[in-house]
């Protein structure tokens, strides 16, 4: 059978009392249940204690009373009674709140920001809030906008709420600035400040600065790093997906660099620590803002283990004719990781023997050839950390014109 | 305590121009709009425009947008609506009115009495 | 625009008794932020209009509790419960959900 909503001992949907007097609430339900307090209150442990107890006839019900003593103006807020354990289907109907103004003569705005003011970020067309709520829903407040405007509510595209502040419904270029809330509470007249930052949500570019595809061993850890270009104005949320995800097998640590004077680059770092099978396959970088939505992906080979494959391009025994400008003596190789390369001429280092020799990856070029050119050229490859070893040998001819 | 003052009555020839006033009192001038209406004889009212006093920003009913003119002087807490070229289907009751959409208000507007504005020769 | 309609007169009702007006929009009032901007006006004899209910169900400030608003998006009812003397006048629904403010032509109460 439906639970009955939690009852809360102060009626209404609303409740004034004076800042330095204690509130007293009580909860009474039919179940186990939960307080749900402003920011503020839940921080103090000094002036706010809970006690529980059976109550009702025979003790059937439960009954929650919360105490805060010395209340203050910023304890101002939603004060709610909760069940606890109930299907979210049911929320609704059993959750008891009220509103608790805390009048503070000295303090008409919950939260004061009269020097440095906040900043709100906004964008065009969505709501916005200024969000200088009251201690009393009886304390006259005015919006201006710097340096003469006042933005006067309309009850539509404008809106005072006391709980919040002025609701704004579609923003505009004209709410971008400083905007003031101001009260005059006794004579004294107080001020709270934000400014708007209009917030775009272009993306300029998006990049996985690593490789593409990746390559690793078995057991290595991958790092990718996706960068996200935007105007200076505009946020932007970074998610990556990959094909081990539902084991939250990633760590991913973000971070903004704000240094250039014309963009924003947002860095976000994926780490997985021992690579295996499982984590092989297409890893995405996401960026979102607000509408606008940009993609980057790189694949991931993970490999057992290290290897070097070798073989002739064409076929073992090469020609060429002397005074030939270049020649490029090149192997096909696969290998993971990259191993170091050296040529060998006749046994001996090629590049050390002349000048003339270069390695170019897996080839040597021999500039300017000439006759002393032709013997046999090995290839050494090896991947020293995983104590592989490969190597193979061609033979050039030289002809002479 | 909130008044909105008008005058009584106008009289003015057709094709003449009229400058009506507004002065406020009571509350900061600043802080609301002032919106004008009219009411010709027997008949119900028209919402004509309204002036935000702060910056002088006015909307008007597409209807009234070549026939009115709205302004304000801060300094007077006062506020002005030009009707120009005036024939016999001008000739109504313009009031002024300070709507107040605040909770603390609990949304109260305050209207002037009104001005009687005869157009004729 | 939008276009408010009223009848021109109520019935005519008995002092101490209830009294009803309506009123039709030509489209629905209510807003995607949940409020209805339905305005109801009593002009009295000789005065200016005076603001009754705001945002269809809303008593504006001073303003007795026998007069009660309800209504869906399009049709609309004012109430008073209690008709005394000085109600007596024109009762006028206007909109303010799309420039311009739009009013209807006025119900005339008639007492007995």
């Known amino acids: 059978s439906k639970l009955k909503d939690p009852e809360l001992s102060l009626k209404g949907t609303q409740h004034i009392m004076q800042a330095g007097q204690t509130l007293h609430l009580q909860c009474r339900g039919e179940a186990a249940h939960k307080w749900s307090l402003p920011e503020m209150v839940s921080k103090e442990s000094e002036r706010l204690s809970i006690t529980k107890s059976a109550c009702g006839r025979n003790g059937k019900q439960f009954c929650s009373t919360l105490t805060l003593n010395t209340a203050q103006a910023n304890h101002t807020g939603f004060y709610s009674c909760k069940y606890l354990a109930v299907p979210t289907s049911k929320k609704k109907e059993t959750e008891s709140a009220i509103y608790i103004f805390i009048s503070d003569t000295g303090r008409p705005f919950v939260e004061m920001y009269s020097e440095i003011p906040e900043i709100i970020h906004m964008t065009e067309g969505r709501e916005l809030v200024i969000p200088c709520r009251v201690t009393s829903p009886n304390i006259t407040v005015t919006l201006k906008k710097f340096p003469l405007d006042t933005l006067i509510p309309d009850g539509k595209r404008i809106i005072w709420d006391s709980r919040k502040g002025f609701i704004i419904s579609n923003a505009t270029y004209k709410e971008i600035g400083l905007l003031t809330c101001e009260a005059t509470v006794n004579g004294h007249l107080y001020k709270t400040n934000y400014l708007t930052h209009r917030q775009t949500n272009t993306i300029i570019d998006v990049q996985i600065s690593t490789p593409r595809p990746v390559k690793l061993l078995r057991g290595h850890t991958l790092v990718l790093n996706c960068t996200a270009t935007t105007p200076l104005n505009t946020r932007v949320q970074m998610t990556w997906s990959y094909p081990d995800e539902k084991n939250k097998r990633a760590s991913v640590r973000r971070r903004i660099d704000q240094s250039n004077s014309h963009a924003n680059i947002f860095y976000s770092v994926l780490t997985i620590d021992k690579m295996q099978n499982k984590d092989k396959g297409l890893y995405t970088c996401r960026v979102r803002s607000g509408p606008s939505f940009k993609s980057v992906n790189t694949s991931v080979h993970i490999y057992d283990k290290a290897f070097i494959t070798v073989k002739h391009r064409k076929q073992q025994v090469l020609e060429t004719v002397a005074g030939k400008r270049s020649y490029r003596l090149s192997m096909k190789v696969k290998a993971f990781p990259s191993p170091e390369v050296v040529w060998l001429k006749d046994g001996l280092p090629a590049t050390e023997k002349s000048a003339r020799y270069l390695t170019r990856g897996y080839s040597l070029i021999i500039k300017d050839v000439t006759e002393e050119d032709a013997g046999n050229y090995t290839i050494l490859l090896s991947i020293k950390q995983s104590n592989v070893f490969k190597n193979l040998t061609a033979t050039l001819i030289v002809n002479v014109k | 305590q909130v008044q909105l003052q008008q005058p009584g009555a106008e009289l003015v020839k057709p094709g003449a121009s009229v400058k009506l006033f507004c002065k406020a009192s009571g509350y900061t001038f600043t802080n609301y709009y002032i919106y004008w209406m009219r009411q010709r004889p027997g008949k119900g009212l028209e919402w004509i425009g309204e002036i935000n006093p702060s910056n002088g920003d006015t909307t008007f009913n597409e209807k009234f947008k070549t026939k009115a003119t709205l302004t304000v002087d801060k300094s007077s807490s006062t506020a002005y609506m030009q009707l120009s070229s005036l024939t016999s289907e001008d000739s109504a009751v313009y009031y002024c009115t300070r709507p107040s959409f605040y909770s603390y208000d609990y949304y109260k507007d305050y209207w002037g009495q009104g001005t009687s504005v005869t157009v004729s020769s | 625009d939008i276009v408010m309609t009223q009848a021109a007169f109520s019935n005519p009702v008995t002092l101490g008794t209830s009294a009803s007006i309506s009123c039709r929009s030509s489209k629905s009032l209510l807003h995607s932020n949940g409020i209805t901007y339905l305005y109801w006006y009593l002009q009295k004899p000789g005065q200016s209009p005076q603001l009754l209910i705001y945002q269809m169900s809303n008593l504006a400030s001073g303003v007795p509790d026998r007069f009660s608003s309800s209504g869906s998006g399009t049709d609309f009812t004012l109430r008073i419960s209690r008709v005394e003397a000085e109600d007596v006048g024109v009762y006028y629904c206007?909109?303010?959900?799309?420039?311009?403010?739009?009013f209807g032509e006025g119900t005339k109460l008639e007492i007995k």
């Open positions: 206007a909109q303010n959900l799309e420039l311009p403010w739009t």
